[in-house]
């Protein structure tokens, strides 16, 4: 490598001097000079800065508003923002998780393929042949039709994607 033709990686140029940036968790109070150092101060209780910076103000931690169905998943530090997630039964409306909506239920004829999390909605799938769901649920998968044969019974009414088969006794031939 050749000698520098710009300030180094963790530096910035001000008044012809390459000054050290403030490290994550600290804000800039004063720039360096030939004789003095960059002066940095730690962010306050509910503040953070997550990069090497020359910011004169720290960012406020995100507020997880319970009125929007939010709760704290991970408390913020001086170097990281607070991470919000949704209350049980709700999920985030965006990646930033600024508000929550109720988990979707899967209608009859559909089962849960993937249960919702704090950040993703319920994923439903249509019940294939041989399976049914007769409820609206955010948890229930499609159930297999009852096997009449294993119970020594016969199918009296065929199943659908919303109903189970109906089994009945076999007709016995009388002599």
């Amino acid at each position: 490598p050749e000698p520098p033709t710009a300030c180094r990686e963790k530096q910035y140029l001000i008044n012809s001097q390459c000054c050290s940036l403030c490290q994550p968790g600290q804000k800039l109070v004063s720039d360096c000079t030939e004789f003095t150092e960059t002066e940095c101060l730690p962010c306050g209780e509910s503040e953070f800065l997550d990069t090497w910076n020359r910011e004169t103000h720290c960012h406020q931690h995100k507020y997880c508003d319970p009125n929007l169905g939010l709760r704290v998943q991970q408390k913020g530090t001086s170097e990281t923002d607070t991470i919000c997630t949704c209350e049980e039964g709700w999920h985030c409306t965006s990646e930033a998780c600024e508000s929550c909506v109720l988990h979707r239920s899967c209608s009859p004829g559909f089962g849960v393929k993937q249960i919702a999390t704090g950040v993703s909605d319920t994923i439903c799938e249509p019940c294939p042949v041989g399976f049914f769901s007769n409820v609206s649920s955010a948890f229930e998968k499609c159930h297999p039709w009852t096997s009449c044969e294993t119970k020594d019974l016969v199918v009296q009414q065929a199943g659908t994607n919303k109903t189970d088969v109906v089994c009945g006794p076999q007709d016995r031939l009388r002599a």
Partner: antibody, heavy 126, light 107 residues
Framework: QVQLVQSGAEVKKSGASVKVSCKAS????????IHWVRQAPGQGLEWMGW????????NYAQKFQGRVTMTRDTSISTAYMELSRLRSDDTAVYYC???????????????????WGQGTLVTVSS | DIQMTQSPSSLSASVGDRVTITCRAS??????LGWYQQKPGKAPKRLIY???SLQSGVPSRFSGSGSGTEFTLTISSLQPEDFATYYC?????????FGGGTKVEIK
């Protein structure tokens, strides 16, 4: 205030290795490169190389390539210079110095050193 | 490597004298050069960068000039505290190289 404090004098046998430390205080250690310069008794100054304390990247003078290793421990704001296969002509005072850059127009960046460590005398006896 | 040839290697002068030290680079280095002062048992101290800008806090009797391959450090009126060894340092290309030094002694 800003200072670099080096480890004490060392006496080593020919063929051995020496590791000199340089503890920084009063500034953000990761923000400035550390250079190493040596001075044999009654002789001039000789640049050995630098280390970027943030990434650990190094740049050594060709003369010392293969014999010098510069490392750092950011948790204790300390840079190290290890010189192996010592010879009697390695007897010198070893200085660490913080690099400062001043923009002097266009792509000109003046490289200067401030502060310097107090120096560590390494004596190599045969 | 860029060779820095400094002259004279030593000189004797009296307080009040004008002193000139020269540094010659083996190839052009623009004005990528600094001057350092070193007193016995101490680390060097920067005086001038790049080539002609005086470090803040350094007395104005020190001045630097030159560009390309020829550089000069001048002390207009030598003071008792100026007796020391002076080095030039080129930072145009790696490896950084120092001149051999000029020892300024009391006559």
């Amino acid at each position: 205030q800003v200072q670099l404090v080096q480890s004490g004098a060392e006496v080593k046998k020919s063929g051995a290795s020496v590791k000199v430390s340089c503890k920084a205080s009063g500034y953000t250690f990761a923000g400035y490169y550390i250079h190493w310069v040596r001075q044999a008794p009654g002789q001039g100054l000789e640049w050995m190389g630098w280390i970027n304390p943030d990434s650990g990247d190094t740049n050594y003078a060709q003369k010392f390539q293969g014999r010098v290793t510069m490392t750092r421990d950011t948790s204790i704001s300390t840079a190290y210079m290890e010189l192996s296969r010592l010879r009697s002509d390695d007897t010198a005072v070893y200085y660490c110095a913080r690099e400062r850059l001043t923009h002097c127009g266009g792509d000109c960046y003046s490289q200067w050193f401030d502060p310097w460590g107090q120096g560590t005398l390494v004596t190599v006896s045969s | 490597d860029i060779q820095m040839t400094q002259s004279p290697s030593s000189l004797s002068a009296s307080v009040g004298d004008r002193v000139t030290i020269t540094c010659r680079a083996s190839q052009g280095i623009r004005n990528d050069l600094g001057w350092y002062q070193q007193k016995p048992g101490k680390a060097p101290k920067r005086l001038i960068y790049p080539a002609s800008s005086l470090q803040s806090g350094v007395p104005s009797r020190f001045s630097g000039s030159g560009s390309g391959t020829e550089f000069t450090l001048t002390i207009s009126s030598l003071q008792p505290e100026d007796f020391a060894t002076y080095y030039c340092l080129q930072h145009n290309s790696y490896p950084l190289t120092f001149g051999g030094g000029t020892k300024v002694e009391i006559k």
